[in-house]
């Protein structure tokens, strides 16, 4: 774990990378993707307590204002900081093609 | 309005730019900022229903999986797509200085 990654809410409760298994049907891809038949989707899930994995100044301000005005300003949100590429084998009119998608799988998470 | 900007939840309920007025005291800046005395903090607030302002393919996947597994996968979240710089006037030992902060005010929002 990186510095500042201690979760005050308890282990695993704060913003971090999770893996969710999904079929092509789950994703609505069955008509246009041949492979993989199942995708290990990595995504960012969890709470963003004060200053935890704060992405930038805006996230830090959001924390301060959320404390003051919780009904108006939401807490920062756990989102991808970067992505891993994924190759999909797709059906085409002439056969198949390999396509790389750069913004599909979360690689790292932060709060913003 | 951009494509995908129609909010199915009603006007102003979906992810968009809001302005929250905050004093230097609210932000914890009173000791180190001379001006402005009050900041119009622009931030991204609102719901992210299906495909609304989806930032990328990851956001689209998240929407699909949230529909299937709402207890496991959260809905996409409304966050800044870009920022506006802000100039703060600060006291210094020799007078005052103007400092620019780049990632402080949200300029545009999307769902991720």
């Amino acid at each position: 774990a990186r510095n500042g990654d201690h979760c005050p809410l308890g282990p695993g409760r704060c913003c971090r990378l999770h893996t969710v298994r999904a079929s092509l049907e789950d994703l609505g891809w069955a008509d246009w993707v041949l492979s993989p038949r199942e995708v290990q989707v990595t995504m960012c899930i969890g709470a963003c307590p004060s200053q935890f994995r704060a992405a930038n100044m805006h996230a830090q301000i959001k924390t301060s204002l959320h404390r003051l005005k919780p009904d108006t300003v939401p807490a920062p949100c756990c989102v991808p900081a970067s992505y891993n590429p994924m190759v999909l084998i797709q059906k085409t009119d002439t056969g198949v093609s390999l396509q790389t998608y750069d913004d599909l799988l979360a690689k790292d998470c932060h709060c913003i | 309005a951009r494509n995908g900007d129609h909010c199915p939840l009603g006007p102003g309920r979906c992810c968009r730019l809001h302005t929250v007025r905050a004093s230097l005291e609210d932000l914890g800046w009173a000791d180190w900022v001379l001006s402005p005395r009050e900041v119009q903090v622009t931030m991204c607030i609102g719901a992210c229903p299906s495909q609304f302002r989806a930032a990328n393919m990851h956001a689209q996947i998240k929407t699909s999986l949230h529909r299937l597994k709402p207890d496991t996968v959260p809905a996409p979240c409304c966050v800044p797509a870009s920022y506006n710089p802000m100039v703060l006037i600060q006291k210094t030992d020799t007078g005052v200085s103007l400092q620019t902060y780049d990632d402080l005010l949200a300029k545009d929002c999307h769902c991720i």
């Epitope: 704060a54 830090q60 | 914890g28 180190w32 400092q99």
Partner: nanobody
Framework: QVQLVESGGGLVQPGGSLRLSCAAS????????MSWYRQAPGKERALVAY???????YHIDSVKGRFTISRNNAENTVYLQMNSLKPEDTAVYYC??????WGQGTQVTVSS
């Protein structure tokens, strides 16, 4: 992700010197106003000095000419060089990034 760790405090005789360090992680100090505060027993935490992103510094009157704040962007570390220490400088010294993040503090005791 945002973390500040102070070190360098200790017991020193009046007239002596100490150099406090504040190691930052999870953000780049170069773009922040980095500050040192202190809290004496029974008193509120109060500003001692800060350094702006552009480099200009500010020191409170009671430490001017004795204390100097500086930073090393490459090491992501902020320093407070304290010379000609007085008993009234006794306090816990905290490093802050101006946006709500604080270190755990380092104790400075000036006594003969």
């Amino acid at each position: 992700q945002v973390q500040l760790v102070e070190s360098g405090g200790g017991l020193v005789q009046p007239g002596g010197s100490l150099r406090l360090s504040c190691a930052a992680s999870g953000f780049t100090i170069r773009t922040y106003t980095m500050s040192w505060y202190r809290q004496a027993p029974g008193k509120e935490r109060a500003l001692v000095a800060y350094i702006t992103p552009g480099g200009p510094t500010y020191h409170i009157d009671s430490v001017k000419g004795r204390f100097t704040i500086s930073r090393n962007n490459a090491e992501n570390t902020v320093y407070l060089q304290m010379n000609s220490l007085k008993p009234e400088d006794t306090a816990v010294y905290y490093c802050g990034n101006g946006f709500g993040s604080w270190g755990q503090g380092t104790q400075v005791t000036v006594s003969s």
